[in-house]
């Protein structure tokens, strides 16, 4: 069971300084920006991240978003990334969801997060290269010091 | 509690192959992998590479990619590491070892090297 | 790829004394490392994990701190089944890499 608490407007980071943004395909890619461009390209760079109470604390659950014309939330069905056009729901009677991750950071580094599934153990967001791209990806992982499954995360509040 | 039982010693000679087996017992949760270790009599233990059952998908150390095979049979529950051209530098134990996630008390995950297989004695020799 | 220097190499101490087993990487690898104990014709054995968390069933007289580049193991009252070797691993990134190894023997 997940419970939704507060949400924050974030800007999400690669470990490359590179920025989140959600393209006009609705596709989230990383892109070399400087604070101007981020603000410009608002609000496909800022994130609405929820946070949610989990009855099996696991770290802390929270569901990725943005509103554009419409509010989009990151999905990771059938462990494929994509965002889906609905809010970020209240209550999730569920152990496990497509939309939850588990917002950690990672040990030693309280600025460096990593984004684990709820509904595959093992697999983090990450942001890998495809072609000229650098795409926002669901990853297995077992390298938990690979900085593709790191990211920064700055309050945009 | 899982056991992992790998196959028995073996005595070969330069050049030939030896493939090691690693037969899982006991419950074990999904999302683990096996990985390989060896270790040269009176030596360290030296990391070989891992085999993940779920997409058969490997990594292996440099010093062995050209010369080790990892595999596994999900309907046995059993993995096996082959390494050819061998040569007297490769007498050592060999150990299969499963790799799965542990976690702390704020669910932040660790991968850990939690049972051993009792090792294999490969003793190449002409 | 990432080096362990595992130090000493080796430690000769008597039962109820306080030994301590460092190991250092050659970069970053966060709190991703483990100790292992050996003992003769056997297999390795967690102790630690996650650089400070005790494995269950571990005595608690084991414990490891350390974050980023810097470990340390310490037994704090050797008892007689402590003599055995020691390794330390990151697993911070592939080729996973060991120390080198500390025996200890008693005095």
């Known amino acids: 069971y997940f419970g939704k608490l507060e949400s924050k407007l974030s800007v999400i980071r690669n470990l490359n300084d590179q920025v989140l943004f959600i393209d006009q395909g609705n596709r989230p890619l990383f892109e070399d920006m400087t604070d101007s461009d981020c603000r410009d390209n608002a609000p496909r760079t800022i994130f609405i991240i929820s946070m949610y109470k989990d009855s099996q604390p696991r770290g802390m659950a929270v569901t990725i978003s943005v509103k554009c014309e419409k509010i989009s939330t990151l999905s990771c069905e059938n462990k494929i990334i994509s965002f889906k056009e609905m809010n970020p729901p209240d209550n999730i009677k569920d152990t496990k969801s497509d939309i939850i991750f588990f917002q950690r950071s990672v040990p030693g580094h309280d600025n460096k997060m990593q984004f684990e599934s709820s509904s595959y153990e093992g697999y983090f967001l990450a942001c890998e290269k495809e072609r000229d791209l650098f795409k926002l990806i669901l990853k297995k992982e077992d390298e938990l010091g690979d900085r593709s499954i790191m990211f920064t995360v700055q309050n945009e509040d | 509690q899982v056991q992992l039982v790998q196959s028995g010693a073996e005595v070969k000679k330069p050049g030939a192959s030896v493939k090691v087996s690693c037969k899982v017992s006991g419950e074990i949760s999904t999302g683990y992998y096996f990985h390989w270790v060896r270790q040269a009599p009176g030596k360290g233990l030296e990391w070989m590479g891992r085999i993940d059952p779920e997409d058969d998908s490997t990594k292996y150390a440099e010093r062995f990619k050209d010369r080790v095979t990892m595999t596994e049979d999900t309907s046995t529950d059993t993995a096996y590491m082959e390494l050819s051209s061998l040569r007297s530098e490769d007498t050592a134990v060999y150990y299969c070892?499963?790799?799965?996630?542990?976690?702390?008390?704020?669910?932040?995950?660790?991968?850990?090297?939690?049972?051993w297989g009792q090792g294999t004695l490969v003793t190449v020799s002409s | 790829d990432i080096q362990m220097t595992q130090s000493p190499s080796s430690v000769s101490a008597s039962v109820g004394d306080r030994v301590t087993i460092t190991c250092l990487a050659s970069?970053?690898?966060?709190?991703?490392l483990t100790w292992y104990q050996q003992k003769p014709g056997k297999a390795p054995k967690l102790l630690i994990y996650?650089?400070?968390k005790l494995q269950d069933g571990v005595p608690s007289r084991f414990s490891g701190s350390g974050s980023g580049t810097d470990f340390t193991l310490t037994i704090s009252s050797l008892q007689p089944e402590d003599f055995a070797t020691y390794y330390c691993l990151q697993g911070s990134k592939f080729p996973l890499t060991f120390g080198q190894g500390t025996k200890l023997e008693i005095k």
């Open positions: 970069e970053d690898i966060y709190t991703y």
């Open positions: 070892t499963t790799w799965r996630i542990y976690r702390d008390s704020s669910g932040r995950p660790f991968y850990v090297m939690d049972a």
């Open positions: 996650g650089a400070n």
